[in-house]
Interface confidence: low
């Protein structure tokens, strides 16, 4: 069973008194409806809480909302509803918080049916003051901030107009009509799709993709016959209808849509979909749905141009368009991703890759766990992780897997141990090495969060009964202490800690229920006195990431380099602190076949590092479309992993020969593209 409060556990002394002095209760003086919480800025301590209560009447819905503000990480809250003139705020738009530490907040108000436009409340001083602004349109979406300039906002209206503000929502201008989808790109560029005839739905597959780089003064049509578009890393993707039939293909651009290439991916039919699972400036993980209602598809990984793709994983679970996938980027270790596959017998299994999609394996069975009823061989099985799909299926999984970039190597997730994901009640497992090895951390489902860059893990049991106990660990989940934070149990609804896992404060949210009323209540616990001293050099130890064979000179090499980290010793009870920066030492590796993905038309047989030709493509010349010209690829089956930094060693050659033939792409070629000005 999981380690608990036994003799071997390094217990924290006098923790009850220390935590009791740092536990702050706040009862919200309103009826329990819904509550949403937003952090304003980083390390500011400012939290906004919006509570809303709906009373459905015969003719209309009467709504009431209250706004609260904390500037001490949730220990105390002040009712600031009067700053928004006691207006009912539309929760479906949430609180639009500005990027970085801009201190900007936009709240969208509910207005009566006959009004000319909507209403927003704007703050640019971390919600100390708000300005009411009446809009010349009714917003359909939340206000979207430009990532480069928080004064620039865009919004779509209920009439499908694209509206832009250049002065943080003070004045608005409609820059285009008949807009379906709009997104900020880099350098304050806006990409959007428009319809010419009926509507977004009717014109799906016949939309135009437009771009404006000057907030609507001038436009450029960068694509036609568009079904949808997306941005990922430095890539712009568009799915484009084929000329001949109802299929569509992905086209990709790395220059903001000036030039396009056809991605070497299968085309999809009407019922299928593409999905960008993850993207960075180096490469893309793309899911391509299988024909029919199978609930699965194939993951492909791109080259550094987003054009040539390799098959990465078959039978990848992804239910329907906009449905559920378990694909998870493990942010605590470079190159690691976890997802689920649907096996032939319809069971769901978890797979993990440590090399950015090059190879996938099952998760190693935790040493302190037995195989469950799904296992055919009781001694050989794997850990299977519950993620979005399990949550959507209403399994007893309160949280998705958790990892944080500054808590190096730590991954926490619900799981079961067997041949497939089990419908039985899951337990919580932890990995301290980015997913290579796992340990059962807690019995039964829990909510969990990481504080102080991994120095503290906090958990609360998932129960239908009122709770008053929180668990915490200072040694990466090996040993647990329990703290009763209130005498009067509450119906627990959620844990909240500042994004980024640097804080030492945790807020426990819930409600109390008496005969006639129920009220929101929060308990904020500051763990600063548990971690009494600042960590020193002696508290850290050197850890080589991705290490599987210390005898091997190339041990730890992933994407052509290895990284040594300074990590907090499990036995050290000290503060990493808010300013903690992960210390890592990279070193370049010699190239091996592991640094190369299999090229298009090639695959790696299981347990083999060599790439072999896919039988169905044997003898076919590989031709693909690049910048509107047909190219011919001569390959020996390998291509370097995007972002791979290896030098020397093995170097399989790959060349691209230009056939100088025009592509039969149905996409606008650059010379046909037109510019327009307002």
């Amino acid at each position: 069973s999981a380690p608990g409060e036994d003799e071997e556990c390094g217990r924290v002394r006098d923790f009850v008194a220390k935590l009791a002095n740092n536990t702050h209760q706040h009862v919200f003086d309103d009826l329990r409806g819904s509550v949403s919480l937003s952090w304003v800025g980083d390390s500011t301590g400012v939290i906004l809480v919006l509570t809303t209560f709906h009373v459905p009447l015969v003719i209309m819905t009467f709504g009431q909302s209250k706004l609260y503000r904390s500037e001490d990480y949730g220990k105390n809250f002040k009712d600031i509803t009067d700053l928004i003139n006691n207006t009912f705020i539309r929760t479906e738009f949430g609180m639009a918080i500005g990027p970085e530490n801009s201190g900007k907040v936009v709240l969208t108000a509910e207005v009566s049916g006959g009004s000319r436009g909507g209403r927003i409340f704007r703050s640019s001083d971390f919600a100390k003051n708000f300005v009411q602004t009446d809009l010349p349109f009714h917003p359909l979406t939340q206000m979207m901030y430009s990532p480069q300039n928080s004064d620039y906002l865009l919004a779509l209206s209920t009439e499908n107009g694209l509206w832009v503000s250049k002065n943080f929502g003070g004045k608005w201008e409609e820059i285009h009509k008949a807009v379906c989808l709009a997104k900020w790109g880099s350098d304050n560029t806006i990409f959007f799709t428009t319809y010419a005839n009926g509507s977004c739905k009717a014109d799906l597959g016949a939309l135009e993709l437009w771009r404006t780089s000057d907030l609507g003064k001038s436009f450029k049509t960068i694509g036609v016959k568009i079904y949808s578009f997306g941005l990922g890393g430095r890539f712009l993707f568009a799915s484009v209808m084929a000329d001949k039939d109802t299929t569509r293909r992905i086209h990709v651009s790395t220059d903001q849509g000036d030039t396009w290439s056809m991605a070497q991916l299968p085309s999809v039919g009407q019922e299928q979909f593409y999905s960008i699972l993850a993207a960075n400036d180096d490469m893309v993980f793309m899911h391509v749905d299988e024909p029919g209602d199978t609930g699965f598809g194939t993951i492909f990984t791109s080259d550094d141009r987003g054009i040539v793709y390799s098959k990465s994983l078959d039978r990848h679970l992804y239910t329907t368009t906009g449905g559920e996938t378990d694909f998870t980027n493990v942010t605590s270790l470079r190159g690691v991703y976890i997802t689920s596959v649907l096996s032939e017998d319809n069971s769901i299994q978890t797979m993990i890759t440590f090399d950015q999609g090059g190879r996938w394996t099952h998760l190693r069975k935790p040493e302190n766990s037995e195989c469950d009823a799904t296992a055919k061989n009781k001694n050989e099985c794997s850990l299977h992780i519950h993620a979005s799909y399990s949550i959507s299926q209403k399994l007893n999984v309160p949280m998705a897997p958790l990892s944080e970039p500054n808590a190096v190597g730590i991954v926490i997730a619900h799981g079961s141990v067997g041949d497939a994901i089990s419908v039985m009640v899951p337990d919580v497992y932890i990995s301290d090495d980015g997913g290579y090895s796992w340990t059962k951390m807690l019995e039964g489902p829990h909510y969990y969060t990481i504080l102080d860059s991994g120095g503290i893990i906090v958990a609360i049991e998932h129960s239908s009964r009122p709770i008053n106990v929180i668990k915490f660990s200072t040694d990466e989940g090996q040993c647990w202490q329990t703290y009763t934070f209130t005498r009067d149990p509450i119906y627990f609804t959620g844990l909240a800690s500042e994004p980024g896992a640097r804080s030492m404060n945790i807020s426990i949210w819930g409600f109390t229920e008496s005969f006639l009323t129920s009220q929101w209540v929060s308990y904020t616990i500051d763990f600063k006195d548990i971690l009494e001293r600042n960590c020193e050099e002696k508290d850290y130890t050197i850890w080589l990431a991705h290490s599987t064979d210390p005898e091997d000179y190339e041990d730890g090499c992933i994407a052509g380099y290895k990284e040594q980290f300074l990590r907090l010793r499990k036995s050290s009870v000290c503060q990493n602190g808010r300013d903690y920066v992960v210390t890592k030492q990279p070193s370049i590796c010699l190239c091996s076949l592991e640094d190369f993905l299999c090229d298009f038309g090639y695959y790696r047989p299981e347990n083999d590092s060599k790439c072999v030709e896919q039988p169905e493509l044997k003898g076919h010349d590989l031709e693909f479309c690049l910048y509107g010209r047909e190219e011919h690829l001569t390959t020996n089956g390998y291509r370097k992993i995007p972002g791979d930094k290896c030098q020397g060693g093995v170097n399989p050659v790959r060349e691209v020969k230009d056939l100088k033939k025009k592509c039969t792409s149905n996409f606008l070629s650059p010379e046909k593209q037109n510019s327009k000005s307002n």
Epitope: Q393, K394, L395, V423, S464, Y491
Partner: antibody
Framework: QVQLVQSGAEVKKPGASVKVSCKAS????????MSWVRQAPGQGLEWMGI????????SYAQKFQGRVTMTRDTSTSTVYMELSSLRSEDTAVYYC??????????????????????WGQGTTVTVSS | EIVMTQSPATLSVSPGERATLSCRAS??????LAWYQQKPGQAPRLLIY???TRATGIPARFSGSGSGTEFTLTISSLQSEDFAVYYC?????????FGGGTKVEIK
């Protein structure tokens, strides 16, 4: 009201297969799992396995692995249990039972087990040469 | 698999008296335990879930307690309709397993 209606009694020869159906009504079929439990004459209850009506994923007791197949038809809200290579000791009453097994009831989801709260009337299967 | 052991196998009690049935698990099942009542020729009926919560429509004379490996079903004052066989069942770890049953008969 919520009910599970099972197919009628069956008499089978050793080595044959039997397929028992269980039709659910009165609730959202895909919102709860379905377990199968059997009871030999004069004996206690024995759990055979469980099926998730949403994806059709199953978990069987080791004893029945390889002999039992549980399937579902969401269009008719019916689950099926097929037991093959029948032997005389498979003579029993077979029950389907709605099993929340980790699915939350109203309110916050729970790690507490809600129990098999609705049972079919049972299907008697007799295996005899 | 987790083995559930019920005791006693048979319990003879007079109407109006208190009946205490015991169920022991071979390893911790936390609170993932249910109790069922079965009368001859009928399907089992859920009495208690989560070790201690009465199912809908179950009279207050039935109560469950325990956690981990030791569990008890108590019938505070036996009525004539309570004479039946009672089973405990764990749902902590697959496969689900039942106890062998306790028959409560009229003394």
């Amino acid at each position: 009201q919520v009910q599970l209606v099972q197919s009628g009694a069956e008499v089978k020869k050793p080595g044959a297969s039997v397929k028992v159906s269980c039709k659910a009504s009165g609730y959202t079929f895909t919102s709860r799992y379905m377990s199968w439990v059997r009871q030999a004459p004069g004996q206690g209850l024995e759990w055979m396995g469980i099926i998730n009506p949403v994806g059709g994923s199953t978990s069987y007791a080791q004893k029945f692995q390889g002999r039992v197949t549980m399937t579902r038809d969401t269009s008719t809200s019916t689950v099926y249990m097929e037991l093959s290579s029948l032997r005389s000791e498979d003579t029993a009453v077979y029950y389907c039972a709605r099993d929340p097994s980790g699915i939350a009831a109203a309110g916050p989801a729970s790690r507490y087990y809600y129990g098999m709260d609705v049972w079919g009337q049972g299907t008697t299967v007799t295996v005899s040469s | 698999e987790i083995v559930m052991t019920q005791s006693p196998a048979t319990l003879s009690v007079s109407p109006g008296e208190r009946a205490t049935l015991s169920c022991r698990a071979s390893q911790s099942v936390s609170s993932n335990l249910a109790w069922y009542q079965q009368k001859p020729g009928q399907a089992p009926r859920l009495l208690i879930y989560g070790a201690s919560t009465r199912a809908t429509g179950i009279p207050a004379r039935f109560s469950g307690s325990g956690s981990g490996t030791e569990f008890t079903l108590t019938i505070s004052s036996l009525q004539s309709e309570d004479f039946a066989v009672y089973y405990c069942q764990q749902a902590r770890l697959g496969p689900w397993t039942f106890g062998g049953g306790t028959k409560v008969e009229i003394k």
